[in-house]
């Protein structure tokens, strides 16, 4: 089979500070040295890119400075963290992995992680 399998958790609950973390693991058919990881959000049938990073195996994952994502990599496993989430951001977050180099190219798409975000209740006014 030439398809690349990508595994990610089915459900994750964001913290009260709007931070959600999950692991994206891929079964690499070859020995890739350059990998691109993209987080996609699927709402209804619309798919949008949340963030993306290209990294060399053995090096750290580097997202753009203004990205809402951070991450670390270890072998064929990527630990992804998405921050700044609000209740309206609840949805399916898909991990997409591309083995860019060396040939052949492989594409792997996970089944998605349903991230639930609950906005914190505002603090009640204090009399003190």
């Amino acid at each position: 089979c030439k398809a690349m399998h990508v595994a990610q958790p089915a459900v994750v609950l964001a913290s009260s500070r709007g931070i959600a973390s999950f692991v994206c693991e891929y079964a690499s058919p070859g020995k890739a040295t350059e990998v691109r990881v993209t987080v996609l959000r699927q709402a209804d049938s619309q798919v949008t890119e949340v963030c993306a990073a290209t990294y060399m195996m053995g090096n750290e994952l580097t997202f753009l400075d203004d990205s809402i994502c951070t991450g670390t990599s270890s072998g064929n496993q990527v630990n992804l963290t998405i921050q700044g989430l609000r209740a309206m951001d609840t949805g399916l977050y898909i991990c997409k992995v591309e083995l860019m180099y060396p040939p052949p190219y492989y594409l792997g798409i996970g089944n998605g992680t349903q991230i639930y975000v609950i906005d914190p209740e505002p603090c009640p006014d204090s009399d003190f």
Epitope: C1, K2, A3, M4, H5, T38, V47, Y101, P104, I109
Partner: antibody, heavy 118, light 108 residues
């Protein structure tokens, strides 16, 4: 409007060269990998070449390897295909295509005809 | 290289009838990486189905895809006049990206 527009096709003699261009508009070009696909008259679709987001990684069909070069200019939202040592069997309509976020080719240009004949 | 073989080469169907097109891969293709395209004369291909069974934006629900592993099917439940065209399957999970040779759906 989201679209791809090819140009640069024409008639060229065997052994000659041609450079195809594909102008992208209506989307963030640098966020997508791109392809060239061709279709010989009365035949099916044949994938020709792929280029990564930043242009660092390039892949080619065996039939064009060593003769064709794919490139992109993200600042100009443009994709290119430099075709050298052209042969009669390269005669085809050439399409540029965008890879969707989930992998298939979701956006195609109208195509540009390349005819290689003496 | 994954070779995709489509059958039949030509399918003659009356408007309103069902059309079933087959695509067989030389080795297993993950269902997430199989697409179907429609092409009419003088036009560029149009994405119909991706991930083996998900309809692309704007594609009517009379088009449906199914299958896994090496055998995939595109079904058009009730053929409309505008559906007579050539259909291609494609795998996009690994390079080289490959297409089937196409099935022409013509009016009976």
């Amino acid at each position: 409007e989201v679209q791809l527009v090819e140009s640069g096709g024409g008639l060229v003699k065997p052994g000659g060269s041609l450079r195809l261009s594909c102008a992208a508009s209506g989307f963030t070009f640098s966020s997508y990998t791109m392809h060239w696909v061709r279709q010989a008259p009365g035949k099916g679709l044949e994938w020709v070449s792929f280029i990564s987001y930043d242009g660092n990684q390039k892949y080619y069909a065996d039939s064009v390897k060593g003769r064709f070069t794919i490139s992109r200019d993200n600042a100009k939202n443009s994709l290119y295909l430099q075709m050298n040592s052209l042969r009669a069997e390269d005669t085809a309509v050439y399409y540029c295509a965008r890879t969707s976020l989930l992998g298939p080719f979701d956006l195609w240009g109208q195509g540009t005809m390349v005819t290689v004949s003496s | 290289e994954i070779v995709l073989t489509q059958s039949p080469g030509t399918l003659s169907v009356s408007p309103g009838e069902r059309a079933t097109l087959s695509c067989r891969a030389s080795q297993s293709v993950g269902s997430s990486y199989l697409a179907w395209y429609q092409q009419k004369p003088g036009q560029a291909p149009r994405l119909l189905i991706y991930g083996a069974f998900s309809r692309a934006t704007g594609i009517p629900d009379r088009f449906s895809g199914s299958g896994s592993g090496t055998d995939f099917t595109l079904t058009i439940s009730r053929l409309e006049p505008e559906d007579f065209a050539v259909y291609y399957c494609q795998q996009y999970g690994s390079s080289p990206w490959t297409f089937g040779q196409g099935t022409k759906v013509e009016i009976k």
